[in-house]
Interface confidence: low
Amino acid sequence: AVITGACDKDSQCGGGMCCAVSIWVKSIRICTPMGKLGDSCHPLTRKVPFFGRRMHHTCPCLPGLACLRTSFNRFICLAQK
């Protein structure tokens, strides 16, 4: 598995990561850490593992965290009750 760097699918990344769109170059996907407490997230992000190609630049939140709305268009990873 690729621990970091370019990828195409989640299976090419290490544990605790997903293959997300680069925030710098949209045509490139890179192995990205899953969301930690307080990280920005997107509520429609696919869960790991996803066997297709992601369209988001964020990964889902780590296990035990949920992607929750904090304002009209902002979501962050918060502890699941």
Partner: antibody, heavy 121, light 111 residues
Framework: EVQLVQSGAEVKKPGASVKVSCKAS????????MHWVRQAPGQGLEWIGY????????TYNQKFKGRVTITVDKSTSTAYLELSSLRSEDTAVYYC??????????????WGQGTLVTVSS | DIVMTQSPDSLAVSLGERATINCKAS??????????MNWYQQKPGQPPKLLIY???NLESGVPDRFSGSGSGTDFTLTISSLQAEDVAVYYC?????????FGQGTKVEIK
């Protein structure tokens, strides 16, 4: 057993405000969002908005922006809908409905019994 | 806003026969390969009841004679063998973007 119990029927004059309550029980209140939906007599369903019971963040149907306020009181596990500047077209049954937490599908799995709000001069 | 249009407005079906309700969205309600469409049943004097979420997922406790299908803009709720207790109004709802919007409803009756 999950239950959503709403306040009783209201009769209001045009221009007034109404506040409907929805007391939740049988689940962890802050783990679920709460939606409000209304239904005019003999008509279909209209989504008003929803609130995160966890942090109070709201999303409203733009149609009601400026007239609607959704709040929660975590200490009593109660959600509130306040609608101001009432007009006759606001006469409807107002429902609270819990979001089922089905991933990104905002599906309303438990509903209150409804509160009839009548706006009449 | 996404406009949801159901057809037919009403439907009379014999007991044990299949009932099919269609719902068309004014734009796609798909996202990342999933379809953000729910179906509800409402009986007179009662609040709506969730039947299907995310186009094809049966809500817990709902009989398996109910099923949902479709993607993009076209969706279907099917009752494979209509029972007397299925007489109700059925609503589709898109939840792909807010405001979440409902169809106008389809009334299902016994023929």
């Amino acid at each position: 057993e999950v239950q959503l119990v709403q306040s009783g029927a209201e009769v209001k004059k045009p221009g007034a405000s109404v506040k409907v309550s929805c007391k939740a029980s049988g689940y962890s209140f802050t783990d679920y969002d709460m939606h409000w939906v209304r239904q005019a007599p003999g008509q279909g369903l209209e989504w008003i908005g929803y609130i995160s019971a966890y942090n109070g963040a709201t999303t409203y149907n733009q149609k009601f922006k400026g007239r609607v306020t959704i709040t929660v009181d975590k200490s009593t596990s109660t959600a509130y809908l306040e609608l101001s500047s009432l007009r006759s077209e606001d006469t409807a049954v107002y429902y609270c409905a819990r979001d089922g937490n089905y991933g990104e599908a905002y599906a309303m799995d438990y509903w209150g019994q409804g509160t009839l709000v009548t706006v009449s001069s | 806003d996404i406009v949801m249009t159901q057809s037919p407005d009403s439907l009379a079906v014999s007991l044990g026969e299949r009932a099919t309700i269609n719902c068309k969205a004014s734009q796609s309600v798909d996202y990342d390969g999933d379809s953000y469409m729910n179906w509800y049943q409402q009986k007179p004097g009662q609040p709506p009841k969730l039947l299907i979420y995310a186009a094809s997922n049966l809500e817990s406790g709902v009989p398996d004679r109910f099923s949902g299908s479709g993607s993009g803009t076209d969706f279907t709720l099917t009752i494979s063998s209509l029972q007397a207790e299925d007489v109700a109004v059925y609503y589709c709802q898109q939840i792909n973007e807010d405001p979440f919007t409902f169809g106008q409803g389809t009334k299902v009756e016994i023929k």
